[in-house]
Amino acid sequence: EVEKTACPSGKKAREIDESLIFYKKWELEACVDAALLATQMDRVNAIPFTYEQLDVLKHKLDELYPQGYPESVIQHLGYLFLKMSPEDIRKWNVTSLETLKALLEVNKGHEMSPQVATLIDRFVKGRGQLDKDTLDTLTAFYPGYLCSLSPEELSSVPPSSIWAVRPQDLDTCDPRQLDVLYPKARLAFQNMNGSEYFVKIQSFLGGAPTEDLKALSQQNVSMDLATFMKLRTDAVLPLTVAEVQKLLGPHVEGLKAEERHRPVRDWILRQRQDDLDTLGLGLQG
């Protein structure tokens, strides 16, 4: 095996081109200079290297940049990104949104891998906060991204970024996360008129306090049952029967089907039977 470590005569790579796909693994290792590879990374994705050959290219870059790759290399990794470990990525300093997008594209169609999670973490920490463009990008690739963040991490989301959030982005958020996001959304949408405001704020209402729900009940919003069921129990309990009736509008009839589930169950138990009877739904307190 020893003689294989030297590059065969006439095989030394002068540039990164298609001829390299016919090199055996050991020839690629012996005949491609790491510095040449780094300067011509933009060509790598144009060449149908085998999945095996990608391992060799990564090894070369690792030797050249033991402290982590520069962004000029990272932005051209393409499918080589699939070969990176979270440990590799922790050494990177990624500042360009275009670089982030290019690497996320490679992982498209999959759940967030540990590699992607590490990449995003490095990027966001480098930026200092989750700005609107970043959030736009991340939620486009990973609708559940926002709900993967801790309440502490969410606290760094500026209210202006909330405009990028779509209802499906909040599907997997728990109450603690919505507690952080709701005040930001309220601030972001504060200048909108009643009906438009409700459309925007609806997905965030799982973090709304009682007083805000009381205020909404005065605005003929006709909240659907799915949204009502996601409200905080402690925020729903103080609402009167009249307020819930106004809040739900024509959807109030849906309470009967949900009478055994929280928060409806707990709310019913707090009401006077006379008041519940006014709804005509047969709810028993």
Epitope: E18, A46, I47, P48, T50, Y51, G109
Partner: antibody, heavy 116, light 107 residues
């Protein structure tokens, strides 16, 4: 929505030629590797050829090398498979598929029958 | 070329069963393996790539595992819509090659 639609299949005599088309929508073929994969009646999958996006580089299975040519027209967002010197053993449903190493989207396939 | 040998070639199972399909590569292919599902008259659908990565929209009852030359596709609880033919594929080296398929039939 990503879609691949093959066309151009049919009955052809041994030694004859056919050109299959793969019209893509919902993505730009200039950014993706396109593969042709075939499946003989009642048999398994056999990879035929690929065209690499950025460079237009092509690779072929030994069984079709020198007879088949894969190409792409980015302005039409369409890939092609030119099949010459067809043999009975080339009879199969031909699928085009997208993806660099694995294939995440496939067309519905077009049947090529080589028979006298 | 790298050969991919699938076993069994067919199996009969009932709804709710745990099903395991194996694929053996003729040489080490690291994690360069994908799995597909194909129903009669339809194109294959990607289930798993990089040996273990579940593709978007694929139910979590499907999982992939393995190392080097031996790979497994597991369906933890077979559903009626899972009766189909399954193929493994290696993409470690060109040409990419497929296993001969495993047909999962209703018992």
């Amino acid at each position: 929505e990503v879609q691949l639609v093959e066309s151009g299949g049919g009955l052809v005599q041994p030694g004859g030629s056919l050109r299959l088309s793969c019209a893509a929508s919902g993505f730009t073929i200039g950014n993706w590797t396109i593969h042709w994969v075939r499946q003989a009646p009642g048999k398994g999958l056999e990879w035929v050829a690929l065209i690499w996006p950025e460079s237009g580089a092509t690779l072929y299975a030994d069984s079709v090398k020198g007879r088949f040519t894969i190409s792409a027209d980015t302005s039409k967002n369409t890939a092609y498979l030119q099949m010459n010197s067809l043999r009975a053993e080339d009879t199969a449903v031909y699928y085009c598929a997208r993806g660099r190493y694995w294939m995440d989207y496939w067309g519905q396939g077009t049947l090529v029958t080589v028979s006298s | 070329d790298i050969q991919m040998t699938q076993s069994p070639s067919s199996l009969s199972a009932s709804v709710g069963d745990r099903v395991t399909i194996t694929c053996r590569a003729s040489q080490d292919v690291r994690d360069g393996v994908a799995w597909y599902q194909q129903k009669p008259g339809k194109a294959p659908k990607l289930l798993i790539d990089q040996m273990v990565r579940l593709y978007s929209g694929v139910p979590s009852r499907f999982s992939g595992s393995g190392s080097g030359t031996d790979f497994t596709l597991t369906i933890s609880s077979l559903q009626p819509e899972d009766f189909a033919t399954y193929y493994c594929q290696q993409y470690f080296n060109w040409p990419v090659t497929f296993g001969q398929g495993t047909k999962v039939e209703i018992k």
